[in-house]
Structures are given as C-alpha cells and as structure tokens.
Interface confidence: low
C-alpha cells in the first residue's frame, strides 16, 4: 500500500535530514521504517507528526527493541519523565521520589528522601526498641508519687548522608512509682519541704476564699 | 494465524470477583501488548487496562483500583480480575492483541464473553 | 476527560459515498493516532483503519481514512457501499488511556 509508494521513492528524499537513518521515507511523514539499530520515534509539531529514526530515545521515552523494527514507547511509569526501560524508571515527575526505578511521593520505611536528586537513598537503619526502663526520678525508685522511664534503641547502620538523620534513638515517659514512699519511712528532705509549702499554699488559698466570699455577701447586703 | 479465546464464567453476583481468561495462540504473549476491552449493552466500549510483552500493566484510571491483568507465560494466556463488581459491570467482554505503542490499535479481537452480574 | 463524539447514524444508498466523523472534545486530532473499527450484527470488532489513514491487508480500498483539523476530527470514508458495510463503526485515539468514540449505525437505504 502506501509503504510501497514510498520505498520506491525513497531516492528523492535521501538528502531530506528527517530521512537519516530511513529506510522507508516521505516528505510529508519522514520515515516510518528504520535502519537496524536505530529507534522510530514519532515526533509530534503542532498538528503534524512525522516519523524520525535516533540512535537514542529522547526524555519521556525508552528504546522498545522488536524483531520489525526498534520504537521509541512513552514511559508508562506512573509519575515517571524518563525511563531506561518498560518498567525502570530513571527520574520521576517534580515532587516524587526515586526508588528501584519507580516513582513515590514519600520514600517506603527505611529510606530516606534525598532532596538534591530527588532519590530514596538508604537512611538511617535503627533496631527495635529495648523494654522500657524502671520508674524513677533523681535516680531514685522511691519517694515520689510521679517518674519517668526510658527506652532506647541503637543505630544498626549508618545512613549513606550526613545530612540524612537518624529517628530518636531514646523516648521517655511519664509514669507512677511503684512505691511512693521508700523503705524505712524515710522521706526526703526536699519532699518533706515540698509538702510544708503545699500546706501552707492551701491555707492561703482557703483564707482567700473565705475573704472573697465575705466580700461578696457584704456587696450584696449593701 | 493468530487467535485468541475468552472464556470465564457467564454470571457473576454482585459484590463478587470477576476472573477471565485469554488465551492466545499463534503469538507468544511475550512478544506483544494485550488489552482486555468490554461493550457494555447499549454498544458502548471501553478499554480496560493492558499487559505489554514484558508483564508491565497500564489501566483505565476510571478501574483502577478495581482491575487487575496478570498472565501466566507457560500457558500462554492472559488474564482480567475485575474486584466489587455490579450490575453496571454486565458486558461482553473482548481481549485483544494492542499494536506497539505509539500507534494504539487492535487489530486481532477475540469473539467475546457475554457477562452477566445479577443476584 | 477525553471524549470522542461520533454521528449516532448515518444512511447511503448502494454504490454511494458516505463520511463518518470521530471529533476530539479536547486537544488537536493529530496528537494521538485514530483507528476505525466496524462490528457487524454483535460479532467482534474488526480493524479498518490504523495511523489515520492506513489500511490492513484484507480490507477493501473502499475504506479510507483521514483527518480534518479543522473540525478537530479523524474521518472514515467508505465509497461505493456495498450491502456488508450495513453495521456499528467506532473510532479509537488517546495515549496512555485509549477512548473509543460513541458509535455510529452505518444503514443502507
């Protein structure tokens, strides 16, 4: 059909530049079948398309070879600009991330996003969480009502970037004395200090009150 | 001469998994894209989603999380699992053998499974 | 979302000339290819036209296709119809999600 037309025409437009590499050429759709090696890739200006062979597949494209003929085929990637194949993406779309050749809005656990290329590189690799620790507050286990315990956990494997940071490697928590007084009887002498000042600040308060409470009764009868 | 063959259940109840075959002879699956397109009652088609030489899929991003094509390369067949169906999803189903991109076209159809989803 | 927008009939008389149009809601025609396809009494579709303009082998030179930018529109033309052209043809373009258009009933007068 219309390939025949153009094979036997295909000497008036070899010094045509769209018809390098052709094997099959016109002048109104450039090539449509390649030399070995080279790549088909349709180019598309405004509403005309035109038949181009390239050595290479430009950006959004990767080199699909077939017994026929070599094509450049668009990356099907989701969120992928440039591919090195079907299905390995080479840089993704503004705002994603690179991994194993895909495309991810946030790096999968364990790596970390690598902001000047955009990449998921290895991050910082942290083991599991050691129990939680005693109760305790000034090193001691006894003589408060309220303490903190801490877990911990250690660094496995260093991230591959010193700017990549590592997850907190040590938590704390607010949590109740298991005895509240120590043995012996014995308290502190802070504590004892303490609870003297919150005797004293009660009665202030209750005085207070008391005031508050004859003044308004005294409004109130006036 | 290549030719291919659905084959599947007829009926399917609604809420339930659709599972289709397509099996392809003449043409290793690995040496071409395939399509799975339905014709919904009133004529109207649509395509599915794709699997292409390699075992990379693409789909219509109104299925998405619903479809999905795998294929099994020994026996050379294809296949659509189609997840929650209902009865909007009463069609006869094609597959079809897609000519390499850029060109987008079928030109090899199989004859079709008639799909019904009722309860 | 991509749509494309075909005549829902059309009727000729034998050994005539008809057009079928596939407009494109949104973009240029020329930006993805157009493919034909015709189905006869609910049997499977059967391709007509790829690339725009270009014919399988086995189906007759009376088929032809081509493209009208100015009505954003991919056009099949059959001439000198003959009784077995009577059935649906649909067109299909898009790139990474293939759309087929609405259909059109070809009827012999």
């Known amino acids: 059909q219309g390939n025949r037309w153009r094979r036997s025409k295909r000497a008036s437009y070899v010094s045509n530049p769209i018809c390098k590499g052709c094997l099959s050429c016109s002048k109104d759709n450039g090539c449509s079948r390649c030399q070995q090696k080279l790549f088909f890739f349709l180019r598309r200006e405004g509403m005309r398309q035109y038949g181009e062979c390239l050595h290479s597949c430009p950006s959004g494209y990767y080199g699909h070879r077939a017994p026929d003929m070599n094509r450049c085929a668009r990356c099907r990637i989701e969120n992928c600009d440039s591919c090195f194949s079907k299905d390995f993406c080479t840089k993704c779309k503004v705002g994603f991330y690179l991994h194993r050749g895909r495309c991810f809005d946030e790096c999968p656990d364990g790596f970390a996003p690598l902001e000047e290329t955009m990449e998921c590189v290895e991050g910082c690799e942290v083991g599991h969480w050691s129990e939680w620790g005693t109760c305790s507050r000034n090193n001691r286990t006894c003589g408060f009502k309220w303490g903190l315990e801490t877990r911990t956990r250690q660094i496995v494997k260093k991230p591959v970037k010193d700017t990549i940071l590592c997850p907190t490697i040590a938590e704390s928590r607010r949590c109740k004395m298991t005895m509240r007084h120590c043995p012996g009887g014995k308290r502190t002498p802070k504590a004892k200090e303490k609870r003297n000042k919150k005797k004293k600040r009660k009665l202030i308060e209750r005085a207070q009150e008391q005031h508050s409470v004859f003044l308004a009764t005294d409004r109130a009868n006036q | 001469q290549i030719q291919l063959q659905e084959s599947g259940p007829g009926l399917v109840k609604p809420s339930q998994s659709l599972s289709l075959t397509c099996s392809v002879t003449?043409?290793?699956?690995?040496?071409?894209?395939w399509s799975w397109i339905r014709q919904f009652p009133g004529k109207k088609l649509e395509w599915m989603g794709y699997?292409?030489?390699?075992?990379?899929?693409y789909y219509n991003p109104s299925l998405e999380n619903r479809i999905s094509i795998t294929r099994d390369t020994s026996k050379n067949q294809f296949f659509l699992h189609l997840k929650s169906v209902t009865t909007e999803d009463t069609a006869t189903y094609y597959c079809?053998?897609?000519?390499?991109?850029?060109?987008?076209?079928?030109?090899?159809w199989g004859q079709g499974i008639q799909v019904t989803v009722s309860s | 979302e991509l749509v494309f927008t075909q005549p829902q009939s059309v009727s000729g008389s034998l050994g005539q000339e008809i057009s079928i149009s596939c407009t494109r809601s949104?973009?240029?025609?020329?930006?993805?290819?157009v493919s034909w396809y015709q189905q006869q009494s609910s049997n499977k579709p059967r391709l007509l036209i790829y690339k725009f303009d270009q014919r399988p082998s086995g189906v007759p030179d009376r088929f032809s296709g081509s493209t009208d930018s100015s009505s954003n529109s991919g056009i099949l033309t059959i001439s000198r119809l003959q009784p077995e052209d009577e059935g649906d043809y649909y067109c299909?373009?898009?790139?990474?999600?293939?759309?087929f258009g609405s259909g059109t009933q070809l009827t012999l007068l």
């Open positions: 003449g043409n290793s699956i690995t040496s071409s894209d």
């Open positions: 699997m292409n030489y390699g075992g990379g899929t």
């Open positions: 949104s973009g240029n025609i020329g930006s993805n290819y």
């Open positions: 079809a053998r897609e000519r390499p991109h850029p060109y987008a076209y079928f030109d090899v």
């Open positions: 299909l373009s898009g790139y990474d999600k293939y759309v």
